[in-house]
């Protein structure tokens, strides 16, 4: 086994790294010079009172993923400057308040993944007045939240509780914290969800529920006594839900008067989209929800899925919708027409094709839509895509990147207000008049272009990296250009005259090209001090490709001999 000392390296700023080794104890000889100590992923099982005694200037201590099962009472007594303490994923089965008492500067504390049943007999965190981020709990043994657990904490930026196997929640336990910007709650079962919800509704701004089985969730009226909910965003992550329980969840969300954003990530819908409310249930009011995000929704019985028409009436006020990687192949025309306030629609990584897009973007569909993202779908014709979107009179931004268009016709029709078009990674090998003249931003990066000779009088930003261009575009065709990103092409040189011809250019990124380091090129690039302000990736990404004896060196460092520069 390697010696403990050999596994630790410290730089001159006192940043010490010793992670992913075979350390079985904290290295001896640590001094006040140490500011940050990372000993994660080792085999430390024990921390003694003397291990960190001299580390009075320590600001960060990371001990995640060791086998620590014992910390002596005064182990942290000299760590008054400590701001970041990570003890996650160890074997601490009993937490002691004496560890944390001296840590008056602590802003981050992670205790996740340790096998304690409760957060101890006394209030662990009452002395931690500067604490901003707290992570507690574990997935199998943490079964009880007590009223004293969070006493003394008034404000937290983030609170993560892994209560996967929670069996007991003492009412008002979480109510003692006056404000939590983001609460992340891991719960396998929903049994105690409503009790917790009642306590956090007036103190949490963003509530995130993870790993919960809501298949049998039933909403029963809350005894809140108050309706002034602070929750602005509710996220469901890796949650299971059914048609019926989704309706119950919506009733719960109804209690949140100021809810603006709703997010479902990696969720499973064990249903067919039959959301018809039973007669005795009052109609759900979506309230002020403006943003709906759904990512990687899994619907096992996808082939039986309904058209969601029962929910159409709830969508009229929504302004932003993202449904990503969820096998969407159609947004029915009627739904599109109901989405009257929709300004932003992201359908990335789905199954949209032109024929169905035509139905989705029917007459009067998405009347307020400004941004449409159809990245990585199954679109194949630029001409048809542009034509299909003509109904969207307010559309200004279109992202159809990562669709395989291959070719581009000579002419296309596009919505008349178009300002932004993303055609990156679409396998196109030429650009034509199909690209609208109204554009201000064009992204054609990662394609097979070897020429760019389009006249785009209003274009301000051109992204054309990872292509096969051999020269900079003609500046006269792009009179308004402010930003040009053309890295990783086949450009061998550019001149002062070329750059000066871009009268309005503020930013150029041209690194990663195969520069011929001629005397002219070197003198121009090395003498122009102002160049560094324009070239945002200078000097690191500007390397010589030839002459061969300077290949791989940075352009700014290369010096050619007098004889090489004065050959006749």
């Amino acid at each position: 086994e390697s010696s403990n000392q050999a596994s630790l390296s410290c730089d001159r700023n006192g940043i010490c790294k010793g992670s992913s080794g075979s350390l079985n104890s904290i290295p001896s000889g640590l001094t006040e010079a140490v500011k940050s100590l990372d000993l994660s992923n080792n085999r430390i099982t024990y921390i003694s009172n003397s291990d960190l005694q001299r580390c009075v200037n320590l600001q960060a201590l990371v001990l995640t993923s060791n086998g620590i099962n014992t910390i002596e009472e005064d182990s942290f007594s000299s760590l008054g400057s400590l701001e970041h303490l990570d003890l996650s994923y160890n074997y601490l089965s009993n937490l002691s308040s004496s560890w944390f008492k001296p840590l008056s500067s602590l802003t981050f504390l992670n205790l996740l993944g340790n096998p304690y049943k409760t957060l101890g007999e006394t209030s662990l965190f009452s002395h931690l007045t500067k604490l901003q981020i707290l992570r507690v709990g574990n997935m199998d043994t943490f079964t009880k939240i007590q009223r004293k657990d969070f006493a003394g904490l008034t404000f937290l930026e983030e609170l993560e509780i892994d209560a996967s196997d929670l069996q007991s929640y003492e009412p008002k336990s979480l109510k003692s914290i006056q404000n939590v910007s983001h609460l992340i709650l891991h719960m396998k079962q929903h049994i105690l969800l409503l009790e917790i919800f009642v306590d956090v509704t007036s103190s949490v701004e963003c509530l995130e529920l993870r790993d919960t089985d809501l298949d049998t969730f039933h909403f029963s009226e809350l005894s809140t006594g108050e309706t002034n909910s602070l929750i602005k965003k509710f996220t469901f992550r890796n949650v299971k839900i059914t048609d019926e329980s989704l309706f119950q969840v919506m009733k719960l969300l109804n209690q949140i008067s100021g809810l603006l954003e709703l997010e479902f990530d990696d969720c499973t819908l064990n249903g067919v989209g039959n959301f018809r409310a039973s007669d005795n249930d009052r109609v759900i009011d979506p309230g002020k929800v403006e943003t709906l995000t759904i990512r990687r929704l899994h619907i096992p019985r996808f082939y039986l899925f309904y058209d969601l028409s029962t929910l159409y009436s709830l969508t009229e006020r929504v302004k932003r919708i993202t449904v990503e990687n969820s096998k969407v192949f159609l947004v029915p025309c009627l739904l599109s027409q109901h989405l009257k306030s929709l300004e932003y629609l992201d359908l990335s990584e789905n199954l949209m094709v032109e024929e169905y897009l035509k139905n989705s973007a029917c007459e009067d569909a998405w009347p307020s839509l400004q941004t449409l993202i159809l990245r990585q779908n199954h679109l194949a014709s630029l001409e048809k895509t542009g034509e299909t979107l003509l109904t969207l009179k307010n559309l200004t931004n279109i992202d159809i990147s990562k669709n395989s268009f291959h070719s581009m016709p000579e002419t296309c029709q596009w919505p008349e207000k178009m300002k932004y078009l993303n055609l990156s990674s679409t396998r196109i090998h030429s650009v034509t008049g199909c690209i609208p003249k109204t554009l201000e931003i064009l992204d054609v990066s990662n394609n097979n272009l070897n020429l760019f000779s389009l006249n785009l009088p209003q274009l301000k930003e051109l992204y054309i990296s990872r292509n096969k261009l051999m020269t900079l575009p003609d500046a006269s065709l792009l009179p308004m250009l402010l930003v040009l990103k053309i890295s990783r092409n086949a450009i061998t040189t550019f001149s002062k005259e070329q750059l000066d011809s871009f009268h309005t250019l503020k930013t150029l990124e041209a690194g990663g090209n195969n520069f011929i380091c001629s005397c002219e090129f070197l003198s121009f690039t090395q003498e122009q001090q102002a160049l560094a302000k324009v070239l945002i990736d200078w000097p690191a990404n500007y390397l010589c490709d030839s002459p061969s004896h300077v290949r791989g060196q940075q352009v700014q460092d290369v010096r050619l001999s007098v004889s090489e520069c004065h050959r006749t």
Partner: antibody, heavy 120, light 112 residues
């Protein structure tokens, strides 16, 4: 040098009980989680039960839950497996195995095993 | 429970051969701490298993460098770059990311 020595195996009738012991030496026993792993004759390895170094948190395979109890005596550096209501399918070589000192660092040292035969 | 499936179940090889054993898990073995808990063990007849590799690719001390582990998520590989006479044994993969801990069914490496 780390050593784990199992004992207590033998022939027992179905429904009977047996208590296995594992004497540990060469390391600070109380600092490490320990497990029992078994291997039926001619078959593969099957994890049976685990116990953490301190605090007594235990975990069991479904096949033995409610019948077997893992425990430890840190003062004696000994791990135990109390086996009740034994069945023919519990016949196996039982190994005690030590965790390596890291998190979920299974299993850096094993004993030589003790054979348990359940037969009438 | 997480199922661990090894292939092949057995193989015949000669000294000096490059041997590859694969192990596939029914769920991802990436734990919430970011680590992937997949170990490889070697067992010779009548002996206790011996750990060769922990956390996918880390060799235990004393294990020859001809043994290497690789993979991520649900697909893992143990490679013996040049088989030696003492390497003829049964090899097991084991996942430590989820309770209960589970082993593959084993791969027996025999002399051709």
């Amino acid at each position: 040098e780390v050593q784990l020595v199992e004992s207590g195996g033998g022939l027992v009738q179905p429904g009977g009980s047996l208590r296995l012991s594992c004497a540990a030496s060469g390391f600070t026993f109380s600092n490490y989680a320990m497990s029992w792993v078994r291997q039926a004759p001619g078959k593969g390895l099957e994890w049976v039960a685990a116990i953490y170094g301190r605090g007594g948190y235990t975990n069991y395979a479904d096949s033995v839950k409610g019948r077997f109890t893992i425990s430890r005596d840190n003062s004696k550096n000994t791990l135990y497996l109390q086996m009740n209501s034994l069945r023919a399918e519990d016949t196996a070589v039982y190994y005690c195995a030590k965790e390596g000192g890291g998190y979920r660092d299974y299993f850096d040292y094993w004993g030589q095993g003790t054979l348990v035969t359940v037969s009438s | 429970d997480v199922q661990m499936t090894q292939s092949p179940s057995s193989l015949s090889a000669s000294v000096g051969d490059r041997v590859t054993i694969t192990c596939r898990s029914s769920q991802s073995l990436v734990f919430s701490d970011g680590n992937t808990y997949l170990n490889w063990f070697q067992q010779k007849p009548g002996k206790a298993p011996k750990r060769l590799i922990y956390k996918v690719s880390n060799r235990d001390s004393g294990v020859p460098s001809r043994f290497s582990g690789s993979g991520s998520g649900t697909d893992f590989t143990l490679t013996i770059s040049s088989l030696q006479p003492e390497d003829f044994a049964t090899y097991y993969c084991m996942q430590g990311a989820h309770w209960p801990l589970t082993f593959g069914q084993g791969t027996k490496v025999e002399i051709k």
